[in-house]
């Protein structure tokens, strides 16, 4: 039966004579007249079992004391701490030639835990122990005892256990305490990796490499390793573990994030409070759920606040110019908490009789700078039909609009286009070319935008480069241009006019008059 005594965490006691209740009962040789078990009182009036010998009068003493068998428990090196008191030979009368002031420490490895006799030849010497000059003054009862402490180690050990022996050669000595222990690096957690109790190596300089295992709710970042030093201290931590998503480090453990907190990734960061407009209802949240009506875009980090679609743009103003419309507006009052706001334009062509019957405008309408994803708050819309009702919707959109599209996010305006000039003439042909004339013909514009009143033909010598041109007007879709110079290149443009005015000139047609009369039907290519 052993009492409880507190020792360092890195020491595992195999034997402690001071913790034994009752007699130690170690084996002495000789049985009488050598080592004797004596009970003394300590400072708390508790009996301590000690062994003493004081055969100082006779020379050649050889008194042995052997412990019981001590299990090795897997240790390869053990330490023996001996607390003893040694009486100065000077304090004993008439013993100068025979009194000694040292004793010897031995050990014997054995798998047999019941060896009854001391066979001196089996024992190997560990060391000769002498009283240290710097002894500890320990109060044993009312006496101040000169208590020496000596520690020796022995190893490597390989058998199941061992015996210790103390050889007295003529000293006056008492073994007050014998403690045998081995050193271990105690179970510890470093960098969120748990390292188990590890017995130190056989050598006083050896390092035992130990791989750690990540604590609950954590994962390896780099393989965690440490070295167990011979003194029972952990050395050189390498690698680490990180708390899993939804967990944070607290006192060497990975604790679940509290309600209202989250952690998205396995990092060494702490749990963070849920961003604005989000919440978590469970411990260990890896993200926070957005409040009703709030959303997170696909590329939004978990740390970003939840946001919502913007409100409608404000102050939409339209400016109609014949078949073009300029629209301008202000930013929405509420951007939904996002910076990525942009605008889309929806164009609808509506019947004059029933404005509710609207159809998309189609691809003939052009938008400047663009129809969708506008970053500015203005757009020009061209190539509309004249005298037509159009409804334009300006939608404010952001990264979460797709999750909750609503009419509340747009503003609209309905306009009617004015009469517009005709579009340009697509194809002009030289039907006949002579030395002095060119016969031209062309098609009606794609969009006449009303009744064509006349066509205007503009022409000039190519070399003059439009510095000096002439105009011919005709109601027909053809005309003969006369009075030209032979063997000369001319450029021709045609445009149409309605009540709304002239359209744009056609692309130029280049024709060269002949030197010899001839007849050519052209397709708009240069004629020679």
């Amino acid at each position: 039966v052993t009492g409880s005594r507190v020792y360092p965490a890195n020491e595992v006691t195999l034997l402690d004579s001071r913790s034994v209740q009752g007699e130690l009962g170690w084996i002495a040789s000789p049985l009488e007249g050598g080592w004797e078990e004596v009970s003394i009182m300590d400072e708390k009036n508790t009996p301590i079992r000690t062994y003493q010998v004081c055969n100082v009068m006779e020379a050649s003493q050889n008194n042995w004391l052997r412990t019981d068998w001590i299990t090795r428990e897997g240790a390869q090196r053990v330490y023996i701490e001996i607390k003893f008191t040694l009486r100065d030979c000077n304090s004993l009368p008439g013993v100068m030639g025979t009194c000694k002031e040292t004793f010897n420490l031995y050990y014997y490895e054995s798998d047999n835990d019941k060896e009854r006799f001391i066979r001196e030849s089996q024992f190997g010497k560990i060391d000769t122990i002498a009283a240290d000059e710097s002894f500890t003054q320990v109060d044993i009862g009312d006496r101040i005892m000169k208590l020496n402490t000596e520690i020796r180690d022995v190893g490597p050990l390989s058998k199941k256990g061992f015996y210790l022996a103390f050889q007295d050669v003529g000293a006056c000595i008492a073994l007050v305490s014998v403690r045998v222990f081995y050193k271990k690096c105690p179970l510890t957690v470093r960098n969120l990796a748990q390292f188990p109790d590890t017995i130190t190596g056989a050598d006083t300089s050896s390092l035992v490499e130990v791989r750690g295992s990540c604590v609950n709710n954590s994962e390896e970042k780099d393989v965690p390793k440490m070295y167990c030093g011979a003194d029972g201290e952990w050395l050189v931590p390498i690698g680490n573990c990180l708390c899993n998503a939804g967990h944070e480090e607290q006192n060497g453990e990975c604790q679940a994030c509290k309600i209202g907190y989250y952690k998205a990734l396995s990092t060494d960061a702490s749990c963070a409070k849920c961003p604005p407009h989000s919440y978590s209802v469970w411990e260990g949240a890896t993200s926070c759920t957005c409040d009703r009506g709030f959303f997170r875009a696909d590329n939004d980090a978990a740390s970003m606040p939840c946001t919502r679609p913007p409100s409608a743009p404000l102050n939409l103003i339209s400016n109609v110019n014949e078949t073009s419309v300029n629209l301008e507006w202000s930013s929405p009052q509420n951007t939904g908490g996002r910076q990525d706001i942009s605008y889309n334009v929806v164009c609808k062509k509506c019947g004059a009789g029933d404005p509710s019957k609207c159809r998309p405008c189609g691809s003939g309408v052009h938008y400047t700078p663009q129809q969708n994803g506008l970053k500015t708050t203005r757009v020009s819309i061209t190539d509309l039909l004249a005298h037509t009702n159009y409804t334009f919707e300006i939608w404010a959109v952001n990264g979460v609009s797709k999750y909750n599209p609503s009419p509340d996010q747009s503003v609209s305006v309905t306009v009617t286009t004015n009469q517009a000039a005709p579009s340009s003439i697509a194809l002009v042909q030289a039907k006949e070319v002579t030395r002095y004339s060119v016969a031209l013909a062309w098609l009606e514009p794609d969009r006449p935008n009303g009744v064509i009143l006349e066509y205007e033909v503009k022409y000039y010598e190519k070399d003059q480069n439009e510095r000096s041109y002439r105009i011919v007007r005709t109601a027909a879709r053809n005309t003969d241009i006369k009075g030209l110079n032979p063997l000369t290149s001319y450029v021709f443009h045609v445009r149409a006019r309605t009540a709304a005015g002239y359209g744009d000139f056609s692309e130029p047609l280049e024709v060269t008059t002949n030197t010899v009369p001839s007849r050519i039907i052209g397709d708009g290519a240069n004629s020679t």
């Epitope: 003493q52 009068m57 008439g94 005892m145």
Partner: antibody
């Protein structure tokens, strides 16, 4: 077991001598010192001195020099106290006692039964 | 020469009571002070050595303490067989006994 055996009572005339033996058994005689103690009738204990049984070297207390001699015969594990020129005031019980030295302190741990020496004319 | 003075000379106690005996040295004897018990017609018996250590076989009702010049022997509960004379002794250069304290039945 460890014993010290002393001889029986002695009656001596003044001026005579007496030799009181103390035979040890149960331990190695030469490993422990032997002390002599006197106790006069109705009086306390009086230490006379001791002898180193290994070297034979005696130590005498004050007042016990000259007429008192400690000696040994190690071959028979016996210590002797010899008193010469006996006087009436030497009448007492004489004890031999084994001296025990220890780390913690010393003491006479085994005693003979005592020899009464009576000096009377 | 170191003189040991024991007190009281006689101590009357009843069985079961506590008895406290004192021994004072004329100069320090460290802790090297044994106590002896002597019953009438018998040789003394070593009770305590080194001021407080009991040899094998001495009952634990006997305890002692002290160092330097003042020493005490205590019998926690006196038994009938404890009525005797008790001597202290010192181991200085010359070993001397105290004059003794007689413990008698009250």
């Amino acid at each position: 077991q460890v014993q010290l055996l002393q001889s029986g009572a002695e009656v001596k005339k003044p001026g005579a001598s007496v030799k009181v033996p103390c035979k040890a058994s149960g331990y190695t005689f030469t490993s422990r010192a032997m002390s002599w103690v006197r106790q006069a009738p109705g009086q306390g204990l009086e230490w006379m001195g001791w002898i180193n049984t290994n070297t034979g070297n005696p130590t005498y207390a004050q007042g016990f020099t000259g007429r008192f001699v400690f000696s040994l015969d190690t071959s028979v594990s016996t210590a002797y106290l010899q008193i010469s020129s006996l006087k009436a005031e030497d009448t007492a019980v004489y004890y031999c006692a084994r001296v025990r030295f220890t780390v913690y302190g010393d003491g006479m741990d085994v005693w003979g039964q005592g020899t009464l020496v009576t000096v009377s004319s | 020469e170191i003189v040991l003075t024991q007190s009281p000379a006689t101590l009357s106690v009843s069985p079961g009571e506590r008895a406290t005996l004192s021994c004072r040295a004329s100069q320090s004897v460290s802790s090297n002070l044994p106590w002896y018990q002597q019953k009438p017609g018998q040789a003394p018996r070593l009770l305590i050595y080194g001021a407080s250590t009991r040899p094998t076989g001495i009952p634990d009702r006997f305890s002692a303490s002290g160092s330097g010049t003042d020493f005490t022997l205590t019998i926690s509960r006196v038994e009938p067989e404890d009525f005797a004379v008790y001597y202290c002794q010192q181991y200085g250069p010359s070993w001397t006994f105290g004059q003794g304290t007689k413990v008698e039945i009250k």
